[in-house]
Interface confidence: low
């Protein structure tokens, strides 16, 4: 399922008054595209330009992070008169041009989405034949990748005064809420420890003091699902074991 927010037009010149009806450079991209991790997403990008019937060499580029300076994730080039844009770069082989640049369409398909793909993307077109010109989206399109929670680490660590503490780290979007349950914590306690913190798509919660032997369970939940993992604390001569 892919959701696209309202389109916005990036246009530096069409707001100006011109006596002649010449077309000006502009780029149309949506503000945001949402898709689930593992799925594919389409990043739409269309443009207008002032060079009527241009059929010279062109290059289509998509970059991530920031305009002009961000790393390129996709690049293709079309020879004079050709509608085939030959791919020169496709990061990890997951980016594919859907649009036809000759028809003012640079739309890109991103396969096998991961949470790390959640960033802003910028399209760019370059003409380099008889006409030398180029234009790049300045605001770009935000790719919002959603994912059900996944617990990526749960562990028991030494704490102060011969005590133990537990850490649970999860990833997901929207950021998951974390809850610990276990001996003397109450039955299925839903309270998220105050030490819970988020970093990007990672959320970590700490259980500062494990005072009883037994099974401690970390539950992560967001609107897309839930996940849980457990550690076991058995104090044999001060040692601990976790699974």
């Amino acid at each position: 399922f892919v959701r696209t927010k309202i389109d916005t037009t990036e246009n530096l010149l069409n707001t100006e008054v011109h006596s002649s009806p010449v077309q000006r450079w502009s780029m149309q991209v949506p503000a945001e595209v949402s898709a689930a991790a593992g799925d594919a997403a389409v990043l739409p990008c269309t443009f207008t330009h002032p060079h009527r019937h241009y059929d010279g060499p062109l290059t289509a580029i998509w970059r991530a992070g920031e305009p002009y300076a961000g790393p390129q994730v996709f690049r293709c080039a079309a020879a004079r008169g050709s509608e085939l844009c030959q791919t020169a770069l496709s990061l990890h082989g997951r980016f594919r041009l859907l649009g036809n640049p000759r028809r003012n369409d640079l739309s890109l398909r991103v396969e096998r989405l991961a949470l790390a793909d959640d960033r802003r993307y910028f399209c760019r077109v370059e003409f380099a034949g008889d006409v030398h010109d180029r234009y790049e989206s300045r605001h770009g399109v935000r790719l919002h990748v959603t994912a059900a929670p996944r617990i990526i680490n749960i562990s028991v660590l030494p704490g102060p005064a011969h005590a133990f503490r537990a850490l649970c780290t999860t990833e997901g979007e929207p950021p998951p809420a974390l809850a610990w349950s276990g001996p003397a914590l109450g039955n299925g306690s839903a309270a998220v420890p105050s030490s819970g913190q988020g970093h990007g798509h990672l959320v970590t919660a700490e259980l500062p003091a494990l005072n009883h032997d037994g099974r401690y369970t970390c539950t992560a939940a967001n609107s897309l699902g839930r996940s849980e993992a457990s550690v076991y604390l058995f104090r044999f001569h001060g040692a601990s074991a976790s699974t």
């Epitope: 530096l12 010149l13 707001t15 100006e16 008054v17 011109h18 000006r24 450079w25 330009h49 002032p50 290059t59 305009p67 002009y68 300076a69 390129q72 370059e126 380099a128 006409v131 030398h132 010109d133 180029r134 234009y135 790049e136």
Partner: antibody
């Protein structure tokens, strides 16, 4: 004849203001982005500011942002640079320059004025 | 900002020599590079744009090449009027930036 002619330079005290003008002739002024480029004595070239053909988009170097304002009057074929809060490091020859292409992007500068000297000193 | 680095900063050559000046960009600028010639007390003059396109009226002994980050300006056979300072400039993105210049002197 295709040409650019700057004026308005001179000696000004730090903190003062100046307005540079650049009169264009021989080409369709409103179709081209225009820029100001400066050159401090004995130094290299430094881009200062660019304005699109219709005047709706303006761009500045960080060193002048908030102090300088570029503008144009297409009915008079004239480009302007209003310089406020001038500093000693703004001392330079200021050139106006025309973009080679007619899009908002200034691909390269194919026509330059003769330059006008701005000296900021107390 | 994109940094442009020219080398050498100065070069001595004789009439008839072949001279090459290089310009390196701090990031990929595709082909969006121009070369200018400037003589003392004069405004710069455009020689080459989009890395390799010769500006109208510029002698064919001037040529440009390169793309990405590395570019060269070549003068195939130096003439007396070619002794000047040469600048490269990127127009890939704002702020536009120039190289520090290469002074071409008579040997």
């Amino acid at each position: 004849e295709v040409q650019l002619l700057e004026s308005g330079g001179g000696l000004v005290q730090p903190g003062g203001s100046l307005r540079l003008s650049c009169a264009a002739s021989g080409f369709t002024f409103s179709s081209y982005a225009m820029s100001w480029v400066r050159q401090a004595p004995g130094k290299g070239l430094e881009w200062v500011s660019t304005i699109s053909g219709g005047g709706g988009s303006t761009y500045y170097a960080d060193s002048v942002k908030g102090r300088f304002t570029i503008s144009r009057d297409n009915s008079k074929n004239t480009l302007y640079l209003q310089m406020n809060s001038l500093r000693a490091e703004d001392t330079a020859v200021y050139y106006c320059a025309k973009a080679i292409g007619s899009s908002w992007y200034s691909d390269a500068f194919d026509l330059w004025g003769q330059g006008t000297m701005v000296t900021v000193s107390s | 900002d994109i940094q442009m680095t020219q080398s050498p900063s100065s070069v001595s050559a004789s009439v008839g020599d072949r001279v090459t000046i290089t310009c390196r960009a701090s990031q990929d600028i595709s082909s969006w590079l121009a070369w200018y010639q400037q003589k003392p007390g004069k405004a710069p003059k455009l020689l080459i744009y989009v890395a390799s396109s010769l500006q109208s009226g510029v002698p064919s002994r001037f040529s440009g090449s390169g793309s990405g980050t590395d570019f060269t300006l070549t003068i195939s056979s130096l003439q007396p009027e070619d002794f000047a300072t040469y600048y490269c400039q990127q127009s890939y993105s704002i702020p536009y930036t120039f190289g520090q210049g290469t002074k071409l002197e008579i040997k």
